[in-house]
């Protein structure tokens, strides 16, 4: 956030610009966190726009017994290893076909024993506060049609009919990982000494970082006809006089009549 | 690039025989897995015949003891040979390849395709 200086009292700014602002010839430059001339206001909405989409990936180990093992198989870059995955593509592709998250899977490794699969299963969703229990959700999907597969595609006299045929007790799950996103964590820490006065909350399922000098959330405060402003104890109302009222109070709601105080025949000297 | 060319169909009186040869380039015989497929019209294609590079062979049960599966490695080609023929038997037969050593009858385990040979058994 920037603000220009035109004129003599450039020079004297520059030496003032605060909260580790710095002079750029112009203007205080100021940190994400500040603006106003000298860098002297702390915003009130910090961008902790959340990812489009959080990804997870499941580490799966499955047996195929449909093929049989060759040192080929070993080699990223052998034929052999780039016809193996291209059937278990295309057969995890229909496993998890009724998964809305699924993206893929990635081969990892694949040892002897008929075939043993070390893969990835990947999985991806549009980001809601709700991505955890989404996600939870499919891994969960991902188990149970990952775990009916291998039961039912399998050898029937050393002869297989299906695209690729599994030991039934040869399916792990190795591990879950999920992409982390605390949008209050990313708030505080974002917010930095001020991280106790802002909060996230969700308009149209996206987080906002505020304080309560933001206008039109639940959190705002009220400050009248005054103006908010966040120290390090707080936001708090800067009251405002105008020609005919001061004003005062928490939240600048109390207003006296400069004429009551001062009397209707007061003159300016 | 593996290529896979069929010849030796024809039309046969039922009780017939023919002999029918897949020659492949792009690819080595002595690895991997090779087969015989066909498809009826109206009829999805099926598993005739295969053999993989360690000596597993394959017959469907209505050729059993009537259709061999052969491969000369030094030609590079893999042969079917069809013995007393029966109308049943009509179909466009498929020579198909893997570098992988299968135990599939599935057709989409078998990445390399000829394409095809019509077979007609009639009188």
């Known amino acids: 956030r920037t603000t220009t200086c035109f004129g003599d009292g450039c020079q004297n700014t520059a030496s003032r610009c605060k909260n580790g602002g710095t002079w750029d010839g112009l203007k205080c430059q100021c940190p994400n966190l500040y603006y106003g001339e000298l860098c002297e206001e702390v915003v009130s909405s910090i961008d902790i726009g959340p990812p489009e989409t959080i990804s997870a990936q499941m580490e799966l180990t499955v047996t195929v017994t449909s093929v049989k093992f060759t040192e080929e198989l070993k080699n990223h870059s052998s034929q052999e290893f780039q016809e193996f995955k291209q059937t278990f593509t295309e057969q995890m592709n229909i496993v998890y076909s009724g998964i809305p998250e699924y993206v893929g899977v990635n081969i990892t490794k694949l040892r002897l024993g008929s075939v043993v699969v070390e893969h990835d299963v990947l999985l991806r969703t549009k980001y809601t506060p709700e991505y955890k229990t989404v996600l939870d959700n499919a891994t969960e999907v991902v188990k149970e049609k990952i775990t009916k597969v291998t039961t039912q595609q399998i050898m029937i006299n050393d002869i297989c009919s299906d695209m690729m045929c599994f030991n039934t007790t040869g399916t792990q799950v190795q591990n879950i990982t999920v992409t982390q996103y605390d949008p209050e964590e990313d708030c505080r820490k974002m917010a930095k000494e001020y991280g106790d006065y802002f909060v996230v909350e969700y308009r149209d399922q996206k987080p906002y970082c505020i304080s309560p000098c933001e206008p039109g959330f639940s959190v705002s405060k009220n400050c009248n006809l005054g103006k908010c402003q966040m120290s390090l104890s707080g936001p708090q109302c800067l009251c405002v006089t105008t020609e005919t009222h001061w004003y005062s109070g928490e939240t600048c709601n109390q207003g006296t009549q400069k004429s009551l105080v001062y009397g209707h025949h007061h003159h300016h000297h | 690039e593996v290529q896979l060319v069929e010849s030796g169909g024809g039309v046969v009186q039922p009780g017939g025989s023919l002999r029918l040869s897949c020659a492949a380039s792009?690819?080595?015989?002595?690895?991997?897995?090779w087969g015989w497929f066909r498809q009826a019209p109206g009829k999805e294609r099926e598993a005739v015949a295969l053999?993989?590079?360690?000596?597993?062979?394959f017959y469907a049960d209505s050729v059993k003891g009537r259709f061999t599966i052969s491969q000369d490695n030094s030609k590079n080609t893999l042969y079917l040979q069809m013995n007393s023929l029966r109308a049943e038997d009509t179909a466009v037969y498929y020579c198909?390849?893997?570098?992988?050593?299968?135990?599939?009858?599935?057709?989409?385990?078998?990445?390399?395709w000829g394409q095809g040979t019509m077979v007609t058994v009639s009188s």
């Open positions: 198909a390849a893997s570098v992988l050593v299968l135990r599939t009858l599935n057709p989409k385990a078998w990445h390399h």
């Open positions: 792009g690819f080595t015989f002595s690895r991997g897995s």
């Open positions: 053999i993989s590079s360690d000596g597993w062979t």
